[in-house]
């Protein structure tokens, strides 16, 4: 016999070595080679069948094709291995050029040997190795990333088999229409969206392979409850109030209750009832520079939601009524009215209106005036005053004045002081 060369002898080579020269193999109950043995193919003039190939693979069958050899012969013998290691032999008429191996196991490799026979002589075998298609399988349907209106699906499936997958989404109470999706057989995930919140669903997945529909697998999913009331936002903060806004599900509420309490709990809570369609409330008439807690809750048929909460500090009040007096060539007094809320300090910034480096002076929060010095004669100055408390600053209040330019202007400057800043004084 012939021995395969190399480290490992192939199953086909081993089969040839053991059987191709041996007489009387017998059928062996269908597991051996059909018919009688032969004298072998050494020195034979028989040509090997040409271009043996597998033209089609299926789960339980393989289709073989080949070309007729030139030399005359009587018949073909086709041998193929089983997963158990046994061989099956089939005798075929000499005009045969194709054959279908049937009754095979899915996803298994098969060795095929095809020889031409004449009398007791055999050609060298043509060889081919091929695997049957894997059986289409799907499993492990998993639901993840659940939101109020969507979820993700993932699953496992035999690769390269399925043309499409069909996903059916059915709500458990059968109140909604069944939704069906058809997606590519290459996919292993799907995002399902546009679902109602707080709803139980059954998900069915099936795969479509040529002429085969697999068994359907299923999973259950429940969309999350919609956050009925959320995103409490405070905006437009000013010394006397702020704007409260929130988000809520459409038609979920009959009314909203907005409660405003000062952080020190010194004042009575203020309550505002709004219709269920409103999403905003502008609050005015609050105290400047103090903390407030805002609570928003919704009512549905008398039931109250747990409130959304936010804490806020109203903006610092700005100084008022800037007055300039005692204006000289190089100095002036600026005074103002303090805001109602207590402040730590005032910052006064002044700069020539034509430009230049601003000067700054900070005074204690109890003061309501200061003297500006080292000014340039005959120059108009822009003055800005802000109140400060900790890191918080009020909106600025501004005004302008012009320093005296010479002796003639001193009388005018004194007149400004006498007339409470009605001359050369602008509120900006």
């Amino acid at each position: 016999g012939s021995t395969a060369i190399g480290m490992k002898e192939t199953a086909a080579a081993k089969f040839e070595r053991q059987h191709m020269d041996s007489p009387d193999l017998g059928t062996g109950g269908g597991s051996g080679i059909e018919g009688r043995g032969s004298m072998g193919y050494r020195g034979s003039e028989l040509d090997t069948p040409k271009d043996l190939q597998v033209s089609e693979t299926a789960e339980t069958s393989l289709t073989l094709l080949w070309k007729t050899p030139l030399a005359k012969f009587d018949r073909y013998r086709l041998n193929y291995s089983l997963p158990t290691g046994q061989w099956v032999g089939v005798q075929l008429p000499r005009n045969t050029t194709s054959y279908v191996l049937r009754g095979l196991e899915p996803g298994q490799e098969y060795n095929v040997l095809l020889t031409a026979e004449k009398g007791r002589h055999k050609s060298k075998p043509a060889r081919v190795k091929a695997s049957t298609a894997k059986e289409p399988e799907i499993g492990n349907l998993n639901v993840s990333d659940i939101t109020p209106e969507s979820f993700n699906l993932s699953w496992m499936a035999t690769d390269g088999i399925f043309e499409t997958f069909t996903i059916e989404i059915i709500d458990s109470n059968r109140l909604l229409e069944t939704v069906e999706y058809n997606i590519s057989g290459a996919e292993r995930t799907a995002h399902i969206s546009g679902l109602p919140p707080s709803t139980d669903f059954i998900v069915y997945l099936s795969g479509l392979a040529p002429s085969i529909r697999t068994k359907t697998i299923s999973a259950t999913a429940t969309t999350e409850a919609l956050p009925l009331l959320e995103n409490l936002t405070i905006s437009d903060i000013n010394p006397y109030g702020f704007t409260v806004s929130w988000m809520a599900s459409e038609n979920a509420f009959d009314s909203f209750l907005v409660t405003v309490v000062d952080s020190g709990k010194l004042l009575d809570p203020q309550e505002f009832t709004l219709s269920g369609t409103q999403r905003k409330l502008e609050l005015r008439g609050l105290i400047t520079g103090i903390g407030y807690e805002v609570m928003v809750s919704g009512f549905t048929q008398g039931h109250q939601t747990k409130p959304l909460r936010a804490e806020i500090v109203t903006a610092m009040g700005s100084p008022k009524e800037v007055i300039f007096s005692d204006i000289t060539e190089n100095s002036a007094t600026v005074s103002w009215r303090a805001p109602t809320a207590q402040v730590e300090s005032f910052r006064i910034t002044y700069v020539p209106i034509t430009g230049g480096t601003p000067s700054m002076v900070t005074v204690d929060g109890t003061k309501t005036q200061t003297r500006l010095v080292k000014l340039i004669p005959g120059v108009e100055y822009l003055v800005s005053i802000i109140a400060m408390k900790g890191f918080e600053e009020s909106e600025p209040v501004s005004g302008s004045f012009t320093t005296a330019s010479g002796l003639n202007d001193i009388f005018e400057a004194q007149k400004i002081e006498w007339h409470e800043g009605t001359h050369h004084h602008h509120h900006h």
Epitope: A225, S255, H303, T305
Partner: antibody, heavy 118, light 107 residues
């Protein structure tokens, strides 16, 4: 004083119909949402249906959806529950209840017994 | 699920404090309401909102809430407090939901 008085209960065969009424007094009926709640013998409370003050919006438990209809006649200060295709499991005492804007089911009637049996 | 879960039965010695609890998804968003029902009578509202009592309800009744759990506390239980207690809330589809009820026995 708020008063709610149910009527219309009785014995009915499976598949039959019944109409319950709830006469209301002591409050502005048209301003308040109303509900029907039932209690099977020896069992807990089960909400059945609700209707808005104007009567424009209605809500139903899944167990009665498509079979029961809630309505109210604000001119007569009366709440109704039309019950069709009655089943044995609908046997219960049926209560009507008032809802205030900030207080749920704050007043209840004394109930009327509905028995569904052949 | 939109159901509310209650312990079927609770007992308390006369004058002692008892807590009846209620669990459910809707209680994450809404406060529970509590109803007292004595045999052969209609239910009576005893607590609603964060911790509000209708007029005529003794101040020994109080309510509290945390996460998906609501509690009704009776401080110094009296014989006349023996009754069934039902928690109640509402879900996102405006359906009222009730707990299965807790039978309170005063010993």
């Amino acid at each position: 004083e708020v008063q709610l008085l149910e009527s219309g209960g009785g014995l009915v065969q499976p598949g039959g119909s019944l109409r319950l009424s709830c006469a209301a007094s002591g409050f502005t009926f048209s301003s308040y949402a109303m509900s029907w709640v039932r209690q099977a013998p020896g069992k807990g409370l089960e909400w059945v249906s609700a209707i808005s003050g104007s009567g424009g919006s209605t809500y139903y438990a899944d167990s009665v959806k498509g079979r029961f209809t809630i309505s109210k006649d604000n001119s007569k200060n009366t709440l109704y529950l039309q019950m069709n295709s009655l089943r044995a499991e609908d046997t219960a005492v049926y209560y009507c209840a008032k809802t205030s804007p900030r207080v749920p089911l704050d007043y209840w009637g004394q109930g009327t017994l509905v028995t569904v049996s052949s | 699920s939109s159901e509310l879960t209650q312990d079927p039965a609770v007992s308390v010695a006369l004058g002692q404090t008892v807590r009846v609890t209620c669990q459910g998804d809707s209680l994450r968003s809404y406060y529970a309401s509590w109803y007292q029902q004595k045999p052969g009578q209609a239910p009576v509202l005893v607590i609603y909102g964060k911790n509000n009592r209708p007029s005529g309800i003794p101040d020994r009744f109080s309510g509290s809430s945390s996460g998906n759990t609501a509690s009704l506390t009776i401080t110094g239980a009296q014989a006349e407090d023996e009754a069934d207690y039902y928690c109640n809330s509402i879900n996102s589809t405006r359906n009222e939901v009730f707990g299965g009820g807790t039978k309170l026995t005063v010993l």
